[in-house]
């Protein structure tokens, strides 16, 4: 249990179009040092959704910004969800490296399904 685990506790999350999707992720340790990133999809074609270290992600809010509770919570909320946002999202821990950070461990993924906007 000493080695870092990336926990994505939900296998699937459902949200109505136009609302915000909350995707949960927790780490069991702060070691190794390095950023967290969120991706949609896996493999070479995956899409970066959020990078803790750098970048501008106007639709993403980190839940820990709201709670100020602890630094092991890397859950995010993505605003203004559309059907195009459906897919499997992965929370990925990177290990600090030089010149580039190295992927260390990924969560199991959470499938986001988008319901039609309530009439």
């Amino acid at each position: 249990e000493d080695e870092l685990q990336v926990i994505q506790p939900e296998k699937s999350v459902s949200v109505a179009a136009g609302e915000s999707a909350t995707l949960r992720c927790a780490m069991t340790s702060l070691i190794p040092v390095g950023p967290i990133m969120w991706f949609r999809g896996a493999g070479a074609g995956r899409e970066l959704i959020y990078n803790q270290k750098e970048g501008h992600f106007p639709r993403v809010t980190t839940v820990s910004e709201l709670t100020k509770r602890n630094n092991l919570d890397f859950s995010i909320s993505i605003s203004n969800i559309t059907p195009a946002d459906a897919g499997t999202y992965y929370c990925v821990k990177f290990r600090k490296g030089s010149p580039d950070d190295v992927e260390f461990k990924s969560g199991a993924g959470t499938e986001l399904s988008v319901r039609a906007k309530p009439s």
Partner: antibody, heavy 121, light 108 residues
């Protein structure tokens, strides 16, 4: 401190839809990082988690009930609700609402006092 | 889903005695994701322990939690009359969140 209170009919007919509401007082349901759950307990039995909603609308359901469950939130009323369709006698239980979070470690606290729903014709 | 098995089902003890309750998970559960609750007849469950070993606010220090991986323990060092109740463990590691079947601590 935050308090939760369940309300709704205590008797539902088989095949109908069970509807319950949980009213949150002493705090805002829109406070980030909290997840608002429904949990039930069959008479004399253990606890079964039904599902949760985040204030923004994200829902997660227990797969065993997913096809029959809808949880919704009304932030303007500081309430969240449970609908369980096509009920049978096996859905007779005490239904609790509870708050989870924020962050990790996680836990359910506080809980509502619970409301008994009986499914019978 | 993660199955939590609590033992014994019933524990018959006298006030002042030590109670040791076990919770075994069907797969490894990081300690941050394990909680214990107490339930008395006609009442809602009450949080006792979170993160496997942290006492909730207002919980007396005679209650303690320990364990990691698949084996967790709730210990009541000296039973008080108000401690006779049913105790549940619960995990948040993987949805659906699940509870153990409970251990009833009764007055012998």
């Amino acid at each position: 401190q935050v308090q939760l209170q369940e309300s709704g009919p205590g008797l539902v007919k088989p095949s109908q839809t069970l509807s319950l509401t949980c009213t949150v007082s002493g705090g805002s349901i829109s406070s980030g990082g909290y997840y608002w759950s429904w949990i039930r307990q069959h008479p004399g039995k253990g606890l079964e988690w039904i599902g949760y909603i985040y204030y923004s609308g994200s829902t997660v359901y227990n797969p065993s009930l997913k096809s029959r469950v809808t949880i919704s939130v009304d932030t303007s009323k500081n309430q969240f609700s449970l609908k369980l369709s096509s009920v049978t006698a096996a859905d007779t239980a005490v239904y609790y609402c509870a708050r989870e979070g924020p962050g990790y470690p996680s836990y359910f606290d506080p809980w509502g006092q619970g409301t008994l729903v009986t499914v019978s014709s | 889903e993660i199955v939590l098995t609590q033992s014994p089902g019933t524990l018959s003890l006298s006030p002042g005695e030590r109670a040791t309750l076990s919770c075994r998970a069907s797969q490894s559960v990081s300690s941050s994701f394990l909680a214990w609750y107490q339930q008395k007849p006609g009442q809602a469950p009450r949080l006792l322990i979170y993160g496997a070993s942290s006492r909730a606010t207002g919980i007396p220090d005679r209650f303690s939690g320990s364990g990691s991986g698949t084996d967790f323990t709730l210990t009541i060092s000296r039973l008080e009359p108000e401690d006779f109740a049913v105790y549940y463990c619960q995990q948040f590691l993987s949805s659906p969140w699940t509870f153990g079947g409970g251990t009833k601590v009764e007055n012998q």
